[in-house]
Interface confidence: low
């Protein structure tokens, strides 16, 4: 109704910036040969580029980045037994962003 | 054999725009990330620009921020840099060069780059 | 920016001399260090990355050591054809860097 419209808070925009997301920790990232075992934890937080940008031929990209090493647990199954192992992982957090120019994509054909 | 063959270079004037292209072959183009680096006469390495495999991350020097772009053509194996608004300390020659590992281009240029072309040669100059 | 810091920037040695060129990062970069050797005219060469692993087809007498903000490159045993500009660079952040350049030249 046209009541519920005048109390209505104004739409923000989501602006470019860095925000937290989850990461998952996929388990090519540890072993790419072998997929007989766990990785703990299965997902962890990142900080990404993320957001609106004014028009359709701009989006939010990250304009510097930073890696962050974390270890990680790398659980294998051996005859039905856990063997813990220790494993780093390289994330790739976003320091700072930009609404840049997109480059106009090419139809896949 | 994996090989990185760069065109493109020349001589132009200062103001002036330029196209550098590198030719892949031997190799998934599409698995890896890659550079450009160039390197002024007498001079050391300059890091360019580094794209991510897929296109989607594009970083680059301060020194070229908004003069220069960097893409790619996965189905033509090929990278290219648009160059723009060229200034005399632009000279130098030009390498692109293959992130190593190639297979995870969230955190694609930890590992160096382990392949590089023979590098084309770009002069700025009136 | 990430400044990375080369010594010396050439040195003279005699082929079986062991030779060591050290960088320092203006900050902690953990282990995200690499080296190459360029030859003149020559592309530039992966040697060491990571800090202190060996690139496929590199001849061991290379090594790479150190974390943090220093490291060390080091020839065991100099040959003819290691004579070159050697340069570390670092992989921790945007926008990537490269030292200034070690010369390696005979003596």
């Known amino acids: 109704s046209l009541g519920s419209l005048t109390i209505a808070e104004p739409a923000m925009i989501a602006e470019c910036k860095t925000r937290t997301e989850v990461f998952e920790i996929s388990r090519r990232l540890i072993d790419r040969t072998n997929a007989n075992f766990l990785v703990w934890p299965p997902c962890v937080e990142v900080q990404r580029c993320s957001g609106c940008c004014n028009n359709r031929n701009v989006q939010c990209r990250p304009t510097q980045v930073q890696l962050r090493p974390v270890q990680v647990r790398k659980i294998e199954i051996v005859r039905k037994k856990p063997i813990f192992k220790k494993a780093t992982v390289t994330l790739e957090d976003h320091l700072a962003c930009k609404c840049e120019t997109v480059a106009a994509a090419r139809p896949v054909t | 054999e994996v090989q990185l063959l760069e065109s493109g270079g020349d001589l132009v004037q200062p103001g002036g725009s330029l196209r550098l292209s590198c030719a892949a072959s031997?190799?998934?183009?599409?698995?890896?990330?890659m550079s450009w680096v160039r390197q002024a006469p007498g001079k050391g390495l300059e890091w360019v620009s580094g794209?991510?495999?897929?296109?989607?991350?594009?970083y680059y020097a301060d020194s070229v921020t908004g003069r220069f772009t960097s893409s790619r053509d996965n189905y033509k194996n090929t990278l290219y840099l648009q160059m723009n608004r060229l200034r005399v300390e632009d000279t130098a020659v030009y390498y692109c060069?293959?992130?190593?590992?190639?297979?995870?281009?969230?955190?694609?240029?930890?590992?160096?780059?382990?392949?590089w072309g023979q590098g084309t040669t770009v002069t700025v100059s009136s | 920016d990430i400044q990375m810091t080369q010594s010396p920037s050439s040195l003279s040695a005699s082929v079986g001399d062991r030779v060591t060129i050290t960088c320092r990062a203006s900050?902690?970069?953990?282990?995200?260090l690499n080296w190459y050797q360029q030859k003149p005219g020559k592309a530039p060469k992966l040697l060491i990355y990571?800090?202190?692993s060996l690139q496929s087809g590199v001849p061991s007498r290379f090594s790479g050591s150190g974390s943090g903000t220093d490291f060390t490159l080091t020839i065991s045993s100099l040959q003819p054809e290691d004579f070159a500009t050697y340069y570390c660079?670092?992989?921790?952040?945007?926008?990537?860097?490269f030292g200034g350049g070690t010369k390696v030249e005979i003596k």
């Open positions: 060069a293959r992130f190593y590992p190639g297979y995870n281009s969230d955190t694609y240029y930890y590992d160096g780059m382990d392949v």
């Open positions: 031997g190799f998934t183009f599409r698995s890896y990330a």
């Open positions: 794209i991510s495999a897929g296109g989607g991350y594009i």
């Open positions: 900050q902690s970069i953990s282990s995200y």
């Open positions: 990571a800090a202190s």
């Open positions: 660079q670092q992989s921790y952040s945007t926008p990537l860097t």
